[in-house]
Amino acid sequence: SGVFQLQLQEFINERGVLASGRPCEPGCRTFFRVCLKHFQAVVSPGPCTFGTVSTPVLGTNSFAVRDDSSGGGRNPLQLPFNFTWPGTFSLIIEAWHAPGDDLRPEALPPDALISKIAIQGSLAVGQNWLLDEQTSTLTRLRYSYRVICSDNYYGDNCSRLCKKRNDHFGHYVCQPDGNLSCLPGWTGEYCQQPICLSGCHEQNGYCSKPAECLCRPGWQGRLCNECIPHNGCRHGTCSTPWQCTCDEGWGGLFCDQDLNYCTHHSPCKNGATCSNSGQRSYTCTCRPGYTGVDCELELSECDSNPCRNGGSCKDQEDGYHCLCPPGYYGLHCEHSTLSCADSPCFNGGSCRERNQGANYACECPPNFTGSNCEKKVDRCTSNPCANGGQCLNRGPSRMCRCRPGFTGTYCELHVSDCARNPCAHGGTCHDLENGLMCTCPAGFSGRRCEVRTSIDACASSPCFNRATCYTDLSTDTFVCNCPYGFVGSRCEFPVGLPPSFPW
């Protein structure tokens, strides 16, 4: 669809005569009839296949024709057509004399024709005007013409329909050749597809308008590139939705079981070394000068009875000091100035000469010790407490403080590993010599029955359109991760499927 435009510019009829040679009285009141038809090698009679148009009286004899496109559109003359422009044409322009106001052919005098021109040729669609001048014996007509496409038509022959739009059916303007040019933020054949936020994950994200990034089920984050872990996952991560892959030091279905108490809680005090020994279980190896389960107790340096031979110990800021009894000297009163003659052995100890009487040694009766048998035997010296238990003197008796997981007088008994109910999901616990074993109920497996092996909700392939299915272990349900272009709990709905063009 387009328009052939004819701009009449100047008509010269200096003598004011008709084609018959007869003069017009008083002058030739001139109007034009235009016939546009398909190309004919010889312009022939017959219909004006591309249209006809007539002008009012434009002037008398010789005159310039005013461009009147703004005021009613009479010049240039418009010859619209509603077919593909063929690129060739025949044009007939007749100048007629109208003595009165009635311009119908039957109302004109028999010889009212002033002049007639017929041209034929090629004409491409374009904005540029072609200027032409036709001269006969008595008249001259100067005019220009062009073919332009109607609104919304484009291309070399005005055959491409393109109507700019910004709605559900497309977001584009039209290029000069009729091809679509998408508005910013849109893409696709008909510019119906929004361009999502830059970096928005191709599979896991989508958008309904430009610069948006909406996440598909199981994904989160600004660019939908972070998976959502299993609901309740405490110390774990995922690489696909609904996973719970435990961080180092954590275990269990929800990664909430602490396997690295040392790192997570730092229970050992005063620079002690911590060793993990099971779930929520640890051992502290104290530095010298400290004691207690968590090495939280500071040992007095005198507690180890460093002073020999009945020397008394005094704590000092930077250590301790031994006050030696008469006859002894040295840092720990270890050197004697006595001999057996001085009866140095207490509590019934018997004295033996050494080094030719320069020194002596006491042989102590049971329950006494020390170089002079001056000390009662410490019942804890022999480390009677097993499994790292701490020995405590309690007057005439002694007792063992056991580490977690041990009991008995000497901490020699393992507390049942089953006492903690370590088997998840109703598993039955069996104590073994070095650990425990869980017998799992139907639908569960793993060392602690923590792995759900119940019916796979994805087994029935509930997701449509090649979506990926994930099983939600906590609810025995499935989640569909839709491919691009589909939404819905089962990815069953297409997103904005390009409809057939509505025009």
Epitope: V42, P45, P47, A118
Partner: antibody, heavy 119, light 111 residues
Framework: QVQLVQSGAEVKKPGASVKISCKAS????????IHWVKQAPGQGLEWIGY????????NYNQKFKGRVTFTTDTSTSTAYMELRSLRSDDTAVYYC????????????WGQGTLVTVSS | DIVMTQSPDSLAVSLGERATISCRAS??????????MKWFQQKPGQPPKLLIY???NQGSGVPDRFSGSGSGTDFTLTISSLQAEDVAVYYC?????????FGGGTKVEIK
Amino acid sequence: QVQLVQSGAEVKKPGASVKISCKASGYSFTAYYIHWVKQAPGQGLEWIGYISCYNGATNYNQKFKGRVTFTTDTSTSTAYMELRSLRSDDTAVYYCARDYDYDVGMDYWGQGTLVTVSS
Amino acid sequence: DIVMTQSPDSLAVSLGERATISCRASESVDNYGISFMKWFQQKPGQPPKLLIYAASNQGSGVPDRFSGSGSGTDFTLTISSLQAEDVAVYYCQQSKEVPWTFGGGTKVEIK
């Protein structure tokens, strides 16, 4: 009123020529075309061709080309058809009719001229 | 050349009745949405008279009972209510291509 008046009947010998006239009145002669149509006795219509009365451009039916010539005289608003090398099958009524670029068709016809070719 | 075939060759219709004449072209006579088809009436001893042009447009002074229809290759002339003065030979004619050609004619008579 529009009129096309043709010359009278002609009797010609085979091999001769005939020139028929068609005088127009009541309209702008130069704006139109003149067609010539043959009708043999008891037969249908056969188109011979046309001439533009404005610039003299012609279009002939191939069947008659070389034996027929169309001319006009704009000063007298008259169109002519000359047919040469006459044969007996040229015996017919010959009509002139006017036509226009704005497709009404051959809306006015002359009364016809009978040409008889006989030895 | 485009061959125009009319049918029937002759037609006898009662006064006031409908008469229908067909014309078939050997190829389409349409161009740019216009049918280059005309119908003429010729009474004995008279020149032809234009009835219909462009397949369906009435010529000047033609009674309304004459109508034309069709496009492409098949055309019809209809006289809705035959009158005595309609007795004549009717010709179809194409002007799409040179040489312009006429149909063989259909003779319409009163039954």
